[in-house]
């Protein structure tokens, strides 16, 4: 057992059917001796007297708030919450595995550029009763600040017969520095607490690998003389790193067609302009990425070519 | 991802164009190590990030652009000292800084470049012979070298007397290759900072 | 104490269908995962699907993905495994087990598809 | 499909040293527990070890289970007559949890 925060305790349990549980010893806190009497939530029943309740705690039921009282008046609280661990491996009940980039990945996180602030974002199907926790370092033996802001309900999504909730979180770097060279992992730590249910997901990343630039701006088309062509052109957009000779993208420009099934015609270049051919009812579209560290392309930034 | 290959004007910063070559020598030479050695913790996740030339060079400090010396957090010590001469500042009027920055790149290069050599030479050993290291990635190195042109004592060739571990040997491997690639991509960023300055 | 009592095997045509059940007691049954495993006859143990506590979630092996499906009747305390379009490579003995350190494993039940 | 290695057979006499291996990788034993089963003819499997090295109660202290990087191992000190079985080991993948992984199995023999 561990406390969370101030009178909120968390019991791990091995979780199997039939398991033997775990004794929680539960102290009241307040200098009286005599005359304390234990109830758990709103019932009435009396499951102990004395400084002390020892419990045998072995599922949800046994969970919850625990009050002492005396003479009608309550001492304390303690809230217990329960963090199964099923055959060695602590549950995911309450986050939806994304399963991007890999497997069990609960937590996604992106960077707009290097100046250290980046939000993290998580899936769930639950509705109520749930609160989120959010910390984060650089390193985890001798961290380093991380200040991350509040959890909040970001999106709602119909799948399927479910309502899907997306979280997010935005944390910054207490001093990053852009141009430096990152050795240390992030570390993002999330508690999610469900009812009576406590789990933590963790994410550990570098800021080079969760690079997601915003799409180009101010995309513009100039057609060409006497020609199918047109001269495309964009700019940086506002949120990447400065200066941009140092922080450098590349581009992807693409050419499609109303139809999906058309051939895409794509150009890569470093410049913020491209020629291209421009056909009837097609849009042009481009995106950027990090010049030099292949992290994530940004999203597309279109015009139609009419 | 194949970077677009840049053709240099004549005019051009002369270390850009190498420096690009570096990047794409030492991503595909990571790419091949990752696939070739899939059974060893090669994943930027799993391996220990290590900088050879902490405490010895002062690449990023040195070479940060001029914009962000603004940033406290930028500024870390800049004690080091290099050799200030070069032929990649030929025909330009450079700072004191500048010849520190690329003296510094330059000593990155020759420390590599040893650690390559002798790492190279264990894994000629191992009866597997399951991974080398890239004679083009040891040559563009070489290049780039040269390009910077700067006076420097040779580093003598680590020998040792001792069996290697191939075990050991592979995942060093790994973890040079992941910070070189790093350190390569820094110094990218500041050729073309450079080049545009 | 726990136990696991399996029904529904039997002799089955290739490219028909069979439901497994596997009925819980001794325990809060919905409290728990549970997973289905098989075994060839001289064969290895192989792993077939898994559901989630609440049912919210199941995963399945490569080899039976879009032909069995896994549910659960937590009222009725039981868990059971759809089987369509049954192949000759699907003839093995069933368990249905708990998820756990400790596991309960049920006394299997034997399906064979042979025409 | 299988991704945890065992040896088909051992064999020894009663009172013999008896050790099954199961080898693996670092996306399964090197990040995960493991578990041996043994099974005797026509029954379901019976747990041995669990997290490792974990004795279930009424398993003889005889089984003992150990793991070290991505191998992990069973050993019987004293083997007797009615442990002849076939045994397994089972872990998990961190990619395809909660997926069982199991061990190609073992036959384990008691001579004489």
């Known amino acids: 057992i561990w406390e969370l925060k101030k009178d909120v305790y968390v019991v791990e349990l091995d979780w199997y059917p039939d398991a033997p549980g775990e004794m929680v010893v539960l102290t009241c806190d307040t200098p009286e001796e005599d005359g304390i009497t234990w109830t758990l939530d709103q019932s009435s029943e009396v499951l102990g007297s004395g400084k002390t309740l020892t419990i045998q705690v072995k599922e949800f039921g046994d969970a919850g708030q625990y009050t002492c009282h005396k003479g009608g008046e309550v001492l304390s609280h303690s809230l217990l919450l329960l963090h199964k661990k099923e055959d060695g491996i602590w549950s995911t009940d309450i986050l939806k595995d994304q399963k991007e980039p890999k497997n069990k990945t609960f937590l996604r996180c992106e960077a707009k550029n290097y100046s250290g602030r980046f939000t993290c974002w998580w899936l769930t199907t639950i509705s109520t009763d749930l609160t989120f926790s959010v910390k984060s370092s650089r390193g985890s033996s001798d961290p380093q600040g991380v200040t991350c802001g509040a959890a909040t309900l970001s999106a709602e999504r119909v799948r399927g017969d479910n309502k899907e909730y997306e979280y997010s979180v935005e944390c910054q770097e207490d001093s990053a520095c852009p141009a430096a060279e990152e050795s240390l992992p992030i570390e993002v730590m999330v508690d999610a607490v469900h009812k009576l249910k406590y789990e933590n997901y963790t994410s550990s990343f570098f800021i080079r690998d969760i690079i997601k630039p915003d799409p180009p701006k101010n995309l513009q088309l100039k057609p060409l003389k006497n020609s199918r062509q047109v001269e495309v052109s964009w700019e940086y957009p506002d949120t990447w790193s400065t200066p941009h000779s140092y922080f450098s993208l590349t581009f992807c420009v693409q050419v499609q067609g109303k139809s999906k099934r058309e051939k895409k015609d794509r150009v890569f270049t470093d410049k913020t302009s491209a020629t291209v051919i421009c056909r009837k009812n097609a849009s042009i579209s481009v995106r950027a990425q990090d010049r030099y560290y292949s992290s994530s392309w940004s999203e597309w930034a279109s015009v139609p070519c009419s | 991802r194949n970077l677009p290959v840049a053709t240099p004007d004549p005019g051009m910063f002369p270390c850009l164009h190498h420096s690009q070559n570096l990047l794409r020598a030492v991503s595909n030479m990571l790419q091949k190590a990752r696939q070739t050695l899939e059974f060893y913790p090669c994943t930027s996740e799993e391996i220990d990030h290590e900088d050879i030339t902490k405490d010895k060079t002062s690449t990023v400090e040195a070479c940060l652009p001029l914009e962000l010396t603004k940033n406290e957090s930028c500024l870390n010590s800049r004690e080091t000292s290099f050799i200030t001469n070069g032929s990649c500042l030929a025909s330009r009027k450079t700072s004191f800084m500048m010849a520190l920055c690329l003296s510094s790149i330059y000593e990155d290069l020759k420390m590599y470049q040893v650690e390559f050599k002798t790492m190279n030479a264990k894994l000629l050993m191992d009866p597997k012979r399951q991974i080398f290291l890239d004679q083009n990635m040891l040559a563009v190195i070489d290049e780039l070298m040269q390009a910077l042109n700067f006076n420097s004592e040779t580093v003598p060739q680590k020998s040792s007397l001792e069996e290697p571990d191939f075990y050991k040997t592979k995942i060093k491997l790994c973890i040079l290759l992941h910070a070189f690639r790093i350190r390569a991509v820094t110094i990218d960023r500041v050729m073309s900072y450079l080049n545009a300055s | 104490q726990v136990q696991l009592v399996q029904s529904g095997g039997g002799v089955v045509q290739p490219g028909r269908s069979l439901r497994l059940s596997c009925a819980a007691s001794?325990?809060?049954?919905?409290?728990?995962?549970m997973h289905w495993v098989r075994q060839a006859p001289g064969k290895g143990l192989e792993w077939v699907a898994f559901i989630r506590y609440d049912g919210s979630n199941k995963y399945y092996a490569d080899s039976v993905k879009g032909r069995f499906t896994i549910s659960r009747d937590n009222s009725k305390n039981t868990l059971y495994l759809q089987m369509k379009s049954l192949r000759a490579e699907d003839t093995a003995v069933y368990y249905c087990?708990?998820?756990?350190?400790?596991?309960?494993w049920g006394q299997g039940t034997m399906v064979t598809v042979s025409s | 499909s299988y991704v945890l290695t065992q040896p088909p057979s051992v064999s020894g006499t009663p009172g013999q040293r008896v050790t099954i291996s199961c080898s693996g990788g670092?996306?399964?034993?090197?990040?995960?527990?493991v578990k041996w089963y043994q099974q005797l003819p026509g029954t379901a499997p019976k747990l041995l070890i669990y997290g490792n090295d974990q004795r279930p109660s009424g398993v003889p202290d005889r089984f003992s289970g150990s793991k070290s990087g991505t191998s992990a191992s069973l050993a019987i000190t004293g083997v007797q007559a009615e442990d002849e079985a076939d045994y397994y080991c089972?872990?998990?993948?961190?990619?395809?949890?909660?997926?069982?992984?199991f061990g190609t199995g073992t036959k384990v023999t008691v001579l004489g």
């Open positions: 001794g325990f809060t049954f919905s409290s728990y995962g």
């Open positions: 670092r996306s399964n034993i090197g990040r995960n527990t």
């Open positions: 087990k708990t998820h756990g350190s400790h596991d309960n």
């Open positions: 089972q872990s998990y993948d961190r990619g395809t949890h909660p997926a069982l992984l």
